[in-house]
Each structure stands twice: as structure tokens, then as C-alpha cells.
Interface confidence: medium
Amino acid sequence: CKAMHVAQPAVVLASSRGIASFVCEYASPGKATEVRVTVLRQADSQVTEVCAATYMMGNELTFLDDSICTGTSSGNQVNLTIQGLRAMDTGLYICKVELMYPPPYYLGIGNGTQIYVIDPEPCPDSDF
């Protein structure tokens, strides 16, 4: 297993609809054809695998398990979108990248993106 640098933004604020997007960029030492991206969440004394996708370079990311994640890839960048977030989902979201094929296997883990989620205030009743 060889180490690889992964960069991601420090802070992202989710939209009022509970959607947060950020870029996960990895410094690929070689020409990987198969890449696995996993998003981990660290908060509330929990470490959660939020979503995971394996993709072939140049193809769309396919996430598993009715995931709250979607994503696209472009070169050594993965554009990740996490949706359906609630205030309780606030936490540090860590991007983990694995170059699966061809060998050698590379692993990189980012420092994490702190995603803040604020539940929208309910609309006040209208008098009209």
C-alpha cells in the first residue's frame, strides 16, 4: 500500500435544501483505470462510511445503497454532492481515495471537509 495526497476544502455550508457539494482531488502517481472513492463522516463519537463508489476513469461514479451521494469525475478530481442532509448530519466529511487498478495499490485520505447543515425555519402561517 502506497500513500497518496488527497485535497479537499476545509469548510462547506449546505444549502437550505440540505445539499452540500465539494471537490476531492488526488495526486495520482500513475495512470489508474479503476478508482474507489469513499466518503467518511466523523462526528458525535461515530465514524460512518457515508457512501462509496468505484468507477473507471472517464466514466460516471455509481454509488451504492440508495446513497445520499452523487458525483462526477474529471481527471484526478471527483465532484461530490451529498443531499438530504439534516442538522444532525453536520460533521467532518473525509474523502478517501483508492487506486484499485492497475497495481500498485495507492491509498489517500483527505483532512476532511467540515459540512455545516442548518435545518430551515418553518414558514410562518400566512394571514392571506
Epitope: 463522516r41 460512518t48 462510511e49 462509496a52 451504492l64 445503497d65 442532509l85 444532525m88 466529511y93
Partner: nanobody, 126 residues
Framework: EVQLVESGGQLVQAGGSLRLSCAAT????????LGWFRQAPGKEREFVAA????????AYADSVKGRFTISRDNAKNTVCLQMNNLKPEDTAVYYC???????????????????WGQGTQVTVSS
């Protein structure tokens, strides 16, 4: 509706291992994430681990990460919790529960789960 029945709890010495099992009956079992929680005497029920519908995604409490492993076998309708290097503070009643929503969540709280089993007692002696 899914029924959950836990088993495997017993008295074990510190440093030992146990494997808890949660057997499920019901057609929708394979569609939902499942979790393990525990409740020690005089304490609130707390999250231990969870696993997604297909078994590809997992969540762990910091206190058990690296010691406990959650897995599921959808062909046999079971979810297992392998507990290694047990500590006296792991003593509790362990409950299996079904997640309320089909989709995998980023966070795991008691309020996210319903349809609880009856629990199985794990006692770790020093």
C-alpha cells in the same frame, strides 16, 4: 413487519470475544439498514454500529471501532456483531434495530431507528 431476535450474549472474561446475531423475519428486511445499540445499567441506550442494506457501508461508535465488526448475510436474514478484545465497560444489553428509512444515513441516532428486538445480555468480567 420485520421481527428481530438477538442471540449470542453471555458472560465472558475481559479480552475475550463474542459474536452476537440478529435474526430477522419479514419481506422488507433486505431493504433497510440495521444497527446495534446497547444499554448499560443506569445509562441511556447508545449507538454501537450500523450496516447498510447491501452490507457495503458501515458505521461504528468511536468506543468500539477497531474491536467490533458488523456484518450481514441477506441470504440468511441475519446481522452479526463480532466483538473482540471485550472490556468491562462493554457490559450491557445489546439490541438490534431497523432503520426507519431505506436510504443510508450519514448519522445514526436512536430516533432514526425503530422496530427493536428484545435484546441479549453481554457481561464482561475483569
Amino acid at each position: 413487519e420485520v421481527q428481530l431476535v438477538e442471540s449470542g450474549g453471555q458472560l465472558v472474561q475481559a479480552g475475550g470475544s463474542l459474536r452476537l446475531s440478529c435474526a430477522a423475519t419479514g419481506r422488507t428486511y433486505n431493504s433497510y439498514p440495521l444497527g446495534w445499540f446497547r444499554q448499560a445499567p443506569g445509562k441511556e441506550r447508545e449507538f454501537v454500529a450500523a450496516i447498510s442494506a447491501s452490507g457495503t457501508l458501515r458505521a461504528y461508535a468511536d468506543s468500539v471501532k477497531g474491536r467490533f465488526t458488523i456484518s450481514r448475510d441477506n441470504a440468511k436474514n441475519t446481522v452479526c456483531l463480532q466483538m473482540n478484545n471485550l472490556k468491562p465497560e462493554d457490559t450491557a444489553v445489546y439490541y438490534c434495530a431497523q432503520h426507519r428509512s431505506v436510504g443510508w444515513r450519514a448519522s445514526h441516532h436512536l430516533s432514526d431507528y425503530d422496530n427493536w428486538g428484545q435484546g441479549t445480555q453481554v457481561t464482561v468480567s475483569s
